[in-house]
């Protein structure tokens, strides 16, 4: 027997239902009460999902798991796991048995968007050219860790002076906090990029500091 | 008929070194995962360590990894066990058994057994 | 890991007792859970497997039910050769842990 699976990993979003594909060929004749089919997790070797004896015996993962039944005979012993949740992130190996054997092993990604980043300014009043500024970029619940990038109003990258931190709460999503530190010019708008590199999503936010008006201080 | 027949126990001292060899028939052995199951004087059972069919995954209980290797040949249809450092507590039958299926792990219980070899690590 | 814990630890029962041995788990192991037979001097002898399944050549007074957490090996009518120690084994997970043993012993 030849088990198959998909080459790419399978991305699945947080608290979405995933399918990781698995088909085998049976031969004509060929009956469920042959059929071993188990799915462990790669590296551990625990135990997720299992089909044996002529009979599916359930989940043995968290019992978000589950085969479709109806499909088993045609040669599909692909797993649907539901809710998915960032630790279920990771290899997953399906292995059926019919007279001989073979398994394939299927990566699944996990991915969470990022929110629209809200930005934050320190000093918020009383804004001088030439005064240095904290311009904070916060953006949550999501998952990889993100990506950020700072320019200014030109489009012109801004490198120096970012700090970005990057925290996973209980759910293992990440708030990302990116600080920019800026002397200000006569006006400026500043955009904050946070990129989640798997879903390739992008989100935005800026701030323009437009001065009351800005103007720069009279020479002695 | 399934048979299992470990051989290379005996005694040694600690911090000696051993090789159990379990020879297997009556089954297509490079079809099943194998594994080593002990036990000490009067005690209960304890996985030691499993092996896949094609040796590509190998697992160890806690208390003798890094001092235990388990290979297998299939051309042989023999298992082994390299037992390294051994300690007082390592005294036990040493169980070669048949894993049901190819791989080893979640759902891959063991079917048949061998008769065991006794190890003995004493000074 | 998962610990795996049988009661009682000994009986003592007459042939053609009714006999029950339970074992519990500290999580889940589905249904991948396994009772072995050891007599004095010799190897585990495999009777259940996938919780209910009867192993080829054990007689059918054996059988065993439960889910989860919990499970009972029970041998209907006993025989003057099923006086021996018995385990519980899960395989749901390495590393494979067993029940600490029954010891079913003659009244």
């Known amino acids: 027997v030849e088990v198959q699976v998909s080459e790419d990993p399978v991305v699945a979003l947080v608290d979405t239902d995933a399918t990781l594909r698995c088909s085998f060929s049976p031969e004509p004749g060929f009956s469920l009460a042959q059929l071993n089919l188990i799915w462990q997790l790669t590296d551990t070797k625990q135990l997720v999902h299992s089909f044996t004896e002529g009979r599916d015996q359930g989940s043995a993962y968290s019992n978000r798991t589950a085969l479709f039944p109806d499909l088993l005979v045609q040669g599909n012993a692909s797993l649907r796991l539901q809710r998915v949740r960032v630790t279920d992130e990771g290899s997953y190996t399906c292995f059926v048995s019919i007279q001989d054997f073979d398994s394939a092993a299927v990566s699944l990604q996990v991915a969470a968007p990022y929110s629209k980043p809200s930005m934050t300014l320190e000093p918020n009043k009383d804004l001088r050219p030439g005064n240095m500024v904290t311009i904070t970029c916060s953006s949550y619940q999501g998952y990889p860790e993100a990506e950020v990038f700072w320019k200014d109003g030109q489009g012109v990258p801004l490198t120096g002076n970012v700090t970005t931190s990057q925290m996973a709460n209980e759910r293992g999503l990440f708030d990302v906090h990116s600080v920019l530190r800026v002397v200000l010019g006569a006006n400026g708008t500043y955009s904050c990029l946070v990129r989640n590199p798997v879903l390739q999503q992008d989100a935005h936010g800026s701030v323009t500091i437009t001065g009351q008006p800005l103007t720069f201080p009279p020479e002695a | 008929e399934v048979q299992l027949v470990e051989s290379g126990g005996g005694l040694v001292q600690p911090g000696g070194s051993l090789r159990l060899s379990c020879a297997a028939s009556?089954?297509?052995?490079?079809?099943?995962?194998m594994g080593w199951v002990r036990q000490a004087p009067g005690k209960g059972l304890e996985w030691v360590s499993s092996i896949s069919w094609d040796s590509s995954s190998k697992e160890y209980a806690d208390s003798v990894k890094g001092r235990f290797t388990i290979s297998r040949d299939n051309s042989k249809n023999t298992l082994y066990l390299q037992m390294n450092s051994l300690r007082a507590e390592d005294t036990a039958v040493y169980y070669c058994a048949r894993a049901w299926i190819a791989i080893i792990g979640g759902g891959a219980h063991f079917d048949y057994w061998g008769q065991g070899t006794l190890v003995t690590v004493s000074s | 890991d998962i610990q795996m814990t049988q009661s009682p630890s000994s009986l003592s029962a007459s042939v053609g007792d009714r006999v029950t041995i339970t074992c519990r788990a500290s999580?889940?192991?589905?249904?991948?859970l396994a009772w072995y037979q050891q007599k004095p001097g010799k190897a585990p002898k495999l009777l259940i497997y996938l919780t209910s399944s009867l192993q080829s050549g054990v007689p059918s007074r054996f059988s065993g039910s439960g889910s989860g957490t919990d499970f009972t090996l029970t041998i209907s009518s006993l025989q003057p050769e099923d006086f021996a120690t018995y385990y519980c084994m899960q395989s749901k997970s390495l590393p494979f842990t067993f029940g600490q043993g029954t010891k079913v012993e003659i009244k």
């Open positions: 999580q889940s192991v589905s249904s991948h």
């Open positions: 009556g089954f297509t052995f490079s079809d099943y995962g």
